[in-house]
Amino acid sequence: KSSNEATNITPKHNMKAFLDELKAENIKKFLYNFTQIPHLAGTEQNFQLAKQIQSQWKEFGLDSVELAHYDVLLSYPNKTHPNYISIINEDGNEIFNTSLFEPPPPGYENVSDIVPPFSAFSPQGMPEGDLVYVNYARTEDFFKLERDMKINCSGKIVIARYGKVFRGNKVKNAQLAGAKGVILYSDPADYFAPGVKSYPDGWNLPGGGVQRGNILNLNGAGDPLTPGYPANEYAYRRGIAEAVGLPSIPVHPIGYYDAQKLLEKMGGSAPPDSSWRGSLKVPYNVGPGFTGNFSTQKVKMHIHSTNEVTRIYNVIGTLRGAVEPDRYVILGGHRDSWVFGGIDPQSGAAVVHEIVRSFGTLKKEGWRPRRTILFASWDAEEFGLLGSTEWAEENSRLLQERGVAYINADSSIEGNYTLRVDCTPLMYSLVHNLTKELKSPDEGFEGKSLYESWTKKSPSPEFSGMPRISKLGSGNDFEVFFQRLGIASGRARYTKNWETNKFSGYPLYHSVYETYELVEKFYDPMFKYHLTVAQVRGGMVFELANSIVLPFDCRDYAVVLRKYADKIYSISMKHPQEMKTYSVSFDSLFSAVKNFTEIASKFSERLQDFDKSNPIVLRMMNDQLMFLERAFIDPLGLPDRPFYRHVIYAPSSHNKYAGESFPGIYDALFDIESKVDPSKAWGEVKRQIYVAAFTVQAAAETLSEVA
């Protein structure tokens, strides 16, 4: 059914009216407004921006807009005692020091409160020792070092290049390898696209540019001192020794000019293969230590950052639903930035602002959505998704009963090539149908649909004529809603061409050079890609909040469950003899998936035929759809990760950014041949198959006829 039928107001107020109200010029204006000064979490500037957004959302016409504050653990450099890394000679003299700040971009020389590059939540320390180059510091890189090259990182300072995986995973891997410090750097191979100039003349990373970021391993916990509960006025806080996810060794990020000085002296083993070489004019020797003439020189880190409990502020806006006010569709994105936030997050926040303005305009004309829409400007996302997680912890009982969907709205762009969507399978059909109705902004696709350009540029690896939609991982504010609470979630943004641009993220990510001018000059001068992202995000929210029957298709979940079961079975079948020895069978899982498929098919048939004029039956069917995602939640969580409770999806244990399917089984099987006690290891595989099969079967039964 079209959204026109959702409420008894004039057909004028439909999806088209909402989309037509969205204007690129407004997004541009909002982006400019949000990026003139830094908005670091926990600072006065970010509090002032919160109050500004609260005021403007009220003006736009929302029913209520409140600030929700929490006191969470944040991390800042010491202003009088800067962090740096040095090379010291045998006498302990510092013969080279890394830079203390990034050279400011043109026009920003006099801006105060630019936080220097640092790794948030690094402990203090001044370790010194030999350097070991560990490539991207992925699990497989440490396997290569330790198992194949027999290089021991214990007591060494490791240097790793940014990219491929979340930086927190790099630090965790280094800790497990026994390192006593970590240096993170941006290699031009990953952050300098060929044929493009560095900022301010292009969108590439200059040699003095540095990526900031947190290095936590929270696994969904939120504030490290109050896991599971909101960091409110009467919170009980853990001691720092018991805090969740804090690194135990000093960590610091540098740019590639400074990295060159460290890496050019490296001796020891040659890189194992070309995949360990970046683009600097250095040998990429692994070490340990410096070569010949420099062998007596060491590397010393000087880290003086402090962890501080600090107040943060979310802005929560409400547009009350006319028919089902107790059903919530949430659009949320963060407001805090490392510096100016030209892309991350303000390209997303500007889009949210324009979506709120458009909804407000419709509301002022007498329209209301069928369901309640909640708009959120999250704080402290950069410090571990803290604002969103604390708010969800505080409101978990409401959310688990009333939450229909969560749409994330961080950076609207990470490139300008094509659309990128990650979402629950329940939203596949919604995204397909919506993008078929939207115009493509891409050159060469004038008059064509967004669906068409997206499918052409980013085809599905499985289904011809369809676009790629990826699994949700983490590293953004949807995490608590999807992975912990089981609320159907999705995210959309414009992205780069992954085939031709092999760099990680976008080059200026989390640097001082992420400015308004970066976007306006190089990424999206007409703000047409921002507008398209606003249409996708806003259109999804509109449909989720307004359609009579929730726009979820449970059959798409059935399809992916079969695909994921096939994938995990094929991984297990690399160990045929152990499967036989320990009687490992996937029959229960495949049977559950088969049952799910059949029940989902029957449910979909009933969905076409039921009497939509009967409000009780309508509500019953919608509740079955809403609670399907919830049915994949295991209250006990995943092993050692209690806040990752979704049995079908979790962030990869090796890369927080990536999603893993059947993560419990996957982790039990990972590197199983290296487990000392095979009986125990395969016993855990069997237990995880049991949990997965039970969960899929239980979820299927929620779609059965109720009586």
Partner: antibody, heavy 116, light 107 residues
Framework: EVQLVESGGGLVQPGGSLKLSCAAS????????MNWVRQASGKGLEWVAE??????????HYAESVKGRVIISRDDSKNTVYLQMNSLRTEDTAVYYC???????WGQGTTVTVSS | NIVMTQSPSSVSASVGDRVTITCKAS??????VSWYQQKPGTAPKMLIY???NRFTGVPDRFTGSGSATDFILTINNLQPEDFATYYC?????????FGQGTKVEIK
């Protein structure tokens, strides 16, 4: 269940050669690193050599005491690991055990006696 | 090479006793230490891995502890079948090395 059965031991003169075999069953042999460990009569355990799996390029490692004189190899199609021993010395006399990675499973051993 | 030094080299005990065997590594080996039991004429059997994890089928009277350089194997409520020689071993780095053994004899 995991089984490792060594064979090929015997009496050999100093300077001679011997090839030990270890037939594995009850596990997916090709996935696992394999070791040889020896024990002289009434003495302690001494690690001799290790061979890794194909995913680790069949990398080999040896104890200093045997380096250059022994070669560890494997045939994944036969689920067998070998220890080719050359230039044998009297101090190589021992029971030779085949073990799986981490020495969590051991064979019953095969006796090598080097004597003139 | 990392040297693993076990003590005592032998211990006399009675059924029901508690026996403690220590193993000292010459350098930090993390928790990459295992304990083995060997009876005359048979191959060693793994008891403990990762310094403190009991291998499948090993009775819970066997307990391992320690990290870095100092490790302990404790046998509580000694049983007749426990009289044997016990070895510690490290798999932290090459060459893998073992302690010289501790013989647990009947008093």
């Amino acid at each position: 269940e995991v089984q490792l059965v060594e064979s090929g031991g015997g009496l050999v003169q100093p300077g001679g050669s011997l090839k030990l075999s270890c037939a594995a069953s009850g596990f997916t042999f090709s996935n696992y690193w394999m070791n040889w460990v020896r024990q002289a009569s009434g003495k302690g355990l001494e690690w001799v050599a290790e061979i890794r799996s194909q995913s680790n390029n069949f990398a080999t490692h040896y104890a200093e005491s045997v380096k250059g004189r022994v070669i560890i190899s494997r045939d994944d199609s036969k689920n067998t690991v070998y220890l080719q021993m050359n230039s044998l010395r009297t101090e190589d006399t021992a029971v030779y055990y085949c073990t799986r990675r981490w020495n969590n499973f051991w064979g019953q051993g095969t006796t090598v006696t080097v004597s003139s | 090479n990392i040297v693993m030094t076990q003590s005592p080299s032998s211990v006399s005990a009675s059924v029901g006793d508690r026996v403690t065997i220590t193993c000292k590594a010459s350098e930090n080996v993390g928790t990459y230490v295992s304990w083995y039991q060997q009876k005359p004429g048979t191959a060693p059997k793994m008891l403990i891995y990762g310094a403190s994890n009991r291998f499948t089928g090993v009775p819970d009277r066997f307990t391992g502890s320690g990290s870095a350089t100092d490790f302990i194997l404790t046998i509580n409520n000694l049983q007749p079948e426990d009289f044997a020689t016990y070895y510690c071993g490290q798999s932290y780095t090459f060459p893998y090395t073992f302690g010289q053994g501790t013989k647990v004899e009947i008093k």
